[in-house]
Structures are given as structure tokens and as C-alpha cells.
């Protein structure tokens, strides 16, 4: 069954998909579609690459990673509840029935509405102490380690770094899982 990924309304969602090019720059066409992968194509295509470049995309959908190295993970900007559902990543490897296709389930949760007591409490609620990174399969979860104790003067710096990092795109409610693969 498909792997499930989560994001909150208003966040960027991150859906991982990778392949290994046979040689640097020797790219394979890839398409991303909304809906489960059909038998040959990609469903309702939101982004497509060819052997050289991204040749089709729609607003809010982009590749944040280095697709020339096979990182064709999809970022969806500023998600809404309507973005929930199955997405298809199809790596159109030349040859007879060589396609690799992946169905990924995106679950969008309503944004948390929290009162505004202390900045310290809000930050630790949004960014729990333990971060993990997920590999290609659901069983490949590795610990990045614990964040050190953070004082108030460090919060905005760390928050900015997290915000600017792709890793922040998929912080989850529980355990703040970061999917990077």
C-alpha cells in the first residue's frame, strides 16, 4: 500500500521520489500526477520532466531537490485540504515495462489554532525535540538526534533555518518526522 505523508494547511508538503541516473545528466522522463498511477501514464499531470529539464508544471508544484541527480521529490506550496489524496510519481525508464511507479498518500490536516502564551511553549509544541529522517521505504527511519536545550535568543535563528530548509516542509505533529528520501 502507499506510504502516507502529512502536512498542515498553509504549509508546504513534500512528497519524496528518487531514482539513480545511469550517468550524471543522463536523465529519465518523470511525471507527477494527482491520483493513483494508471497503467501507462501519470494521472492528472501536475509536473513533468524530460531528458533535460522540467518541461511542464502547474502553479504551487515544483521540484526543490536536484532533479539532475535523480531527486524528483515534489513540493506543493501552501497546501489546502483539497490537496489531500493520492499522488503518482512515475519514473519513465526506457525499455520494456521498466517504469517505476509510486503512489504516495498526502494527508492535509487543518492548521492548529493555539493561544499565544509564551514563545518558548509554542516553539516546543511545534518542533518536538526528536527529529527523524525517513528513507525510501517506510521501515527506513533513522534518528538524527535530539535538539539541544534552546534558549529564547536561539529560537528565531533555528526557526529561520528550519523554515528555509526543505526539511521543514514535512514536520509532523507527532515526532516531527522529516521525510528526505
Amino acid at each position: 500500500s502507499e506510504v502516507e505523508y502529512r502536512a498542515e494547511v498553509g504549509q508546504n508538503a513534500y512528497l519524496p521520489c528518487f531514482y539513480t541516473p545511469a550517468a550524471p545528466g543522463n536523465l529519465v522522463p518523470v511525471c507527477w500526477g494527482k491520483g493513483a498511477c494508471p497503467v501507462f501514464e501519470c494521472g492528472n499531470v501536475v509536473l513533468r520532466t524530460d531528458e533535460r529539464d522540467v518541461n511542464y508544471w502547474t502553479s504551487r508544484y515544483w521540484l526543490n531537490g536536484d532533479f539532475r541527480k535523480g531527486d524528483v521529490s515534489l513540493t506543493i506550496e501552501n497546501v489546502t485540504l483539497a490537496d489531500s489524496g493520492i499522488y503518482c510519481c512515475r519514473i519513465q525508464i526506457p525499455g520494456i515495462m521498466n517504469d517505476e511507479k509510486f503512489n504516495l498518500k498526502l494527508v492535509i490536516k487543518p492548521a492548529k489554532v493555539t493561544p499565544a502564551p509564551t514563545l518558548q511553549r509554542d516553539f516546543t509544541a511545534a518542533f518536538p525535540r526528536m527529529l527523524t529522517t525517513r528513507g525510501h521505504g517506510p521501515a527506513e527511519t533513522q534518528t538524527l538526534g535530539s535538539l539541544p536545550d534552546i534558549n529564547l535568543t536561539q529560537i528565531s535563528t533555528l526557526a529561520n533555518e528550519l523554515r528555509d530548509s526543505r526539511l521543514a516542509n514535512d514536520l509532523r505533529d507527532s515526532g516531527a518526522t522529516i521525510r528526505i528520501g
Partner: antibody
Framework: EVQLVESGGGLVQPGGSLRLSCAAS????????MSWVRQAPGKGLEWVAA???????YFPDSVKGRFTISRDNAKNSCYLQMNSLRAEDTAVYYC?????????????WGQGTLVTVSS | DIVLTQSPATLSVSPGERATLSCRAS??????????MQWYQQKPGQAPRLLIY???NVESGIPARFSGSGSGTDFTLTISSLQSEDFAVYYC?????????FGGGTKVEIK
Amino acid sequence: EVQLVESGGGLVQPGGSLRLSCAASGFTFSRYAMSWVRQAPGKGLEWVAAISSGGSLYFPDSVKGRFTISRDNAKNSCYLQMNSLRAEDTAVYYCARGREADGGYFDYWGQGTLVTVSS
Amino acid sequence: DIVLTQSPATLSVSPGERATLSCRASESVEYYGTSLMQWYQQKPGQAPRLLIYAASNVESGIPARFSGSGSGTDFTLTISSLQSEDFAVYYCQQSMKVPLTFGGGTKVEIK
């Protein structure tokens, strides 16, 4: 208007080869999977090959290793190369456009070209 | 391979009557809530024409008297009131798995 026009059919001896062409017009050819479907005289329909928009190839076991499919997006054309032909390959061969975003079913068909394998 | 069995092989119907054609798959063609089954019409000397896709969606330009239903392994094409131009052979086709397969066809003839 979407049009698919097949050519290249004819009489060929068993063991021989033939190349069918399908000229497409009226749509953005590169975005669609294309298939070939055949129909033996008085018989039903049989899918024989497909090529996705990205160039991946698909065949049933009955023709795998003997037939190959290719496309030239610059020429809006799709081809079926048929080698080691047998009497049972005798049929009308249709070029068909796979439905956009899916490819696994066919919303436009050509008029067909007859291939006869006989000595 | 997914085998599609159509019945009856021949259906004799009078114009204006209802025609019900059946297609049974050897395994389910359900995929993420969609039934990947299509229906085509073919008249002598012509290419097939898509009537119904995903079990119940009527293709653009197809008269409303054609409808499709079913899920899993059992599917039905219904022609509510047969017109003279509807006498033809009808094929079902699955797009669940490679190889794509067609049913053997049902010939609808004038009674």
C-alpha cells in the same frame, strides 16, 4: 480534429518483417501514450503494443521479442516494427491514442491497415 | 492475464427495446476506488469507438441511451432503447494491468 492514419500494411511471407506507421494530427502528440491494437479476420480485438509519453514500452507475451514500438514526437508519428511474422499475425492493425493522463484505454482510433502473412 | 468473458455472444433485440450486455473479469479491476473497465462499439468495416470509460462514465458525444455499471469483476452495458445505428459488436476492455485485454465481444443484431 484528431486524426490517426496508419500505413505500411501489406502481404509478407512467414518469417518476414514489416514496419507500420501511424501519422497523428490534431493534438499534442508528445503528451499521449500510443498503442497498436489488431483484429484478425472475423475475430475480436487484441492489444499488441503501447508506448508511453515518456517512451516506456509495453507488449503482451504473444509478440514480445518479435514486435517493437517507437515514436518520433518531432514527426507526430508512432511505429510498429514487426519481425518474425507468423500466419497468426494476419490482422487489421489499428493505431489508437491512449486517453490523456491514463493511456490504458483508447479514445481515438485510425482506420486500420491490413497485414497478411502468407506464403 | 485478466480474462474478460462477455455474454451473450449474440443478442437479438427489436428496435426500441432495451439491451443488456455483460462482461465478467477473471479478477477485480478495482483500483483506488475506480473500476478500470471500458466499453467500445464496432460496426463492420469500421474502427472501434469508445462508449464508456471507468465502468460508468459516458464518453463525450455518445448518446445518453448508453450507460455502464458494475464494479469489481461484473460489469454491464445497457442500451435503453435500441436505435437502428446501435446494431453492432460491443467489446469490454480492462486497463487495470498489462497486458490490456478485451472481451470476446457481443454482437447485437436485429430481432
